[in-house]
């Protein structure tokens, strides 16, 4: 199976959020197809996305086997219509990806405020725990399950009537903050892994939720609301 006129892939890039992990590359194929291989440092290469005309490959199923391992992927280029031939010794053109360690490098997805509940001058704000595709004993793990205390949330809150923001931090998914009685507050949260020293240390901010809207109400009004 000759590999003449096939070009090696380039710009191999990992795109990963909450461990959902896709390898992307160029170029868009003209008369060629791609196969991806992925390995940890063991060198046990596993083939994925066989003879695809796409320029991306979902490698989530492989990296979630051990998110603390470091992975390398490589993309092989074959002529379109390629049929695997056992007799061929010619190595197709390929390129290696950068190394990727999911635990250190996956981006933190935008969090969501699940609920808030006011009791007097205290408000309990709960952050929704996102599910990931990481498994343990055939059970999917949440982001908190995977990161444990390495993951914190920062809460930004402010009176609806002013712009001065306050912050609180938690290494659980709950905040208990003091508020002024009779004031409505708005809330936004951000996921943070403080031990990271890179750009992917923080998530984007959650959508803003404000008291007096349906996500949560003061208990004093007689109804408090939880969205799941």
């Amino acid at each position: 199976s000759g590999t003449t006129n096939t070009v090696a892939a380039y710009n191999l890039t990992w795109k990963s959020t909450n461990f959902k992990t896709i390898l992307e590359w160029e170029p868009k194929p003209i008369n060629q197809v791609y196969t991806v291989q992925i390995s940890t440092k063991s060198g046990d290469w596993k083939s994925k996305c066989f003879y695809t005309a796409d320029t991306e490959c979902d490698l989530t199923d492989e990296i979630v086997k051990d998110v603390k391992q470091t992975y390398l992927a490589r993309v092989f280029s074959y002529p379109a219509g390629h049929v695997e031939s056992t007799g061929s010794t010619e190595e197709p053109p390929y390129e290696n990806s950068p190394e990727f360690t999911p635990y250190l490098e996956t981006n933190l997805g935008q969090p969501t405020i699940q609920s808030f509940e006011q009791v007097g001058t205290k408000v309990n704000v709960t952050v929704q725990d996102e599910w990931t595709l990481v498994r343990r004993n055939d059970t999917f793990l949440s982001l908190r399950d995977v990161f444990g205390k390495d993951l914190i949330y920062t809460l930004y809150y402010w009176k609806s009537s002013s712009s001065g923001k306050k912050t609180a931090k938690t290494n659980t998914n709950e905040f208990l903050i003091d508020v002024d009685k009779g004031e409505n507050y708005c809330f936004s949260v951000q996921a943070v892994i403080p031990s990271r020293r890179t750009a992917n240390r923080k998530s984007t901010d959650s959508p803003v939720e404000c008291m007096g809207h349906e996500k949560g109400e003061s208990r004093e009004t007689g109804h408090h609301h939880h969205h799941h």
Partner: antibody, heavy 118, light 106 residues
């Protein structure tokens, strides 16, 4: 501390066989590909063979293909090189090395000397 | 097979000198290149991988650069401990080493 210790070298006649071993410690052995590199007296480095962490993938230099067999026993943290049909040109110091992805060698043993001579 | 050619084969230098060793590949190997240092009677030691990534514990006076077919190892200020033989190694397709460059005292 990561350590690799080769053994099994010695003097052997042309056509003879020898089995080299490499005992690994200080890291999770099965997590890494491993390799053998040799160096003939006064010469440069020559890659010989690589094996993946599971032992499922093996690679050989053309100069040893069909004569040498690389293997590993992950339960014993040991790498092996079975060398058959030895030739004078196989005379060298044989180094065992830890080889992430099977690509480069980040830890080396001290080496064991193989001499093929009649 | 990809051939790796190192130059010079021998280099005479003094302590404090800036030293540059070149390695050329017979075809493009992207950045898949490592550099090793070897002293007489000792095992090689990894200095640089992926053309420019410094291995942990290696002094910062060592640096690597290049991609494609031409690569360099630079020692910014040669120290007494640096007199040794240096090898490049490609890992784009299987593994091949360069012939080595011996750095000796002038």
């Amino acid at each position: 501390e990561v350590q690799l210790l080769e053994s099994g070298g010695g003097l052997v006649q042309p056509g003879g066989s020898l089995r080299l071993s490499c005992a690994a410690s200080g890291f999770t052995f099965s997590d890494y590909a491993m390799g053998w590199v040799r160096q003939a007296p006064g010469k440069g480095l020559e890659w010989v063979s690589t094996i993946s962490g599971s032992g499922g993938l093996t690679y050989y230099a053309d100069s040893v293909k069909g004569r040498f067999t690389i293997s590993r026993d992950n339960s014993k943290n040991t790498l092996y090189l079975q060398m058959n049909s030895l030739r004078a040109e196989d005379t060298a110091v044989y180094y065992c090395a830890k080889a992430p992805y099977g690509y480069y060698m980040d830890v080396w043993g001290k080496g064991t000397t193989v001499t093929v001579s009649s | 097979d990809i051939q790796m050619t190192q130059s010079p084969s021998t280099l005479s230098a003094s302590v404090g000198d800036r030293v540059t060793i070149t390695c050329r590949a017979s075809q493009s190997i992207s950045s898949w290149l490592a550099w090793y240092q070897q002293k007489p009677g000792k095992a090689p030691k990894l200095l640089i991988y992926k053309a420019s990534s410094l291995e942990s514990g290696v002094p910062s006076r060592f640096s690597g650069s290049g991609s494609g077919t031409e690569f360099t190892l630079t020692i910014s200020s040669l120290q007494p401990d640096d007199f040794a033989t240096y090898y490049c190694q490609q890992y784009k397709s299987y593994i091949t080493f360069g012939g080595g460059t011996k750095v000796e005292i002038k």
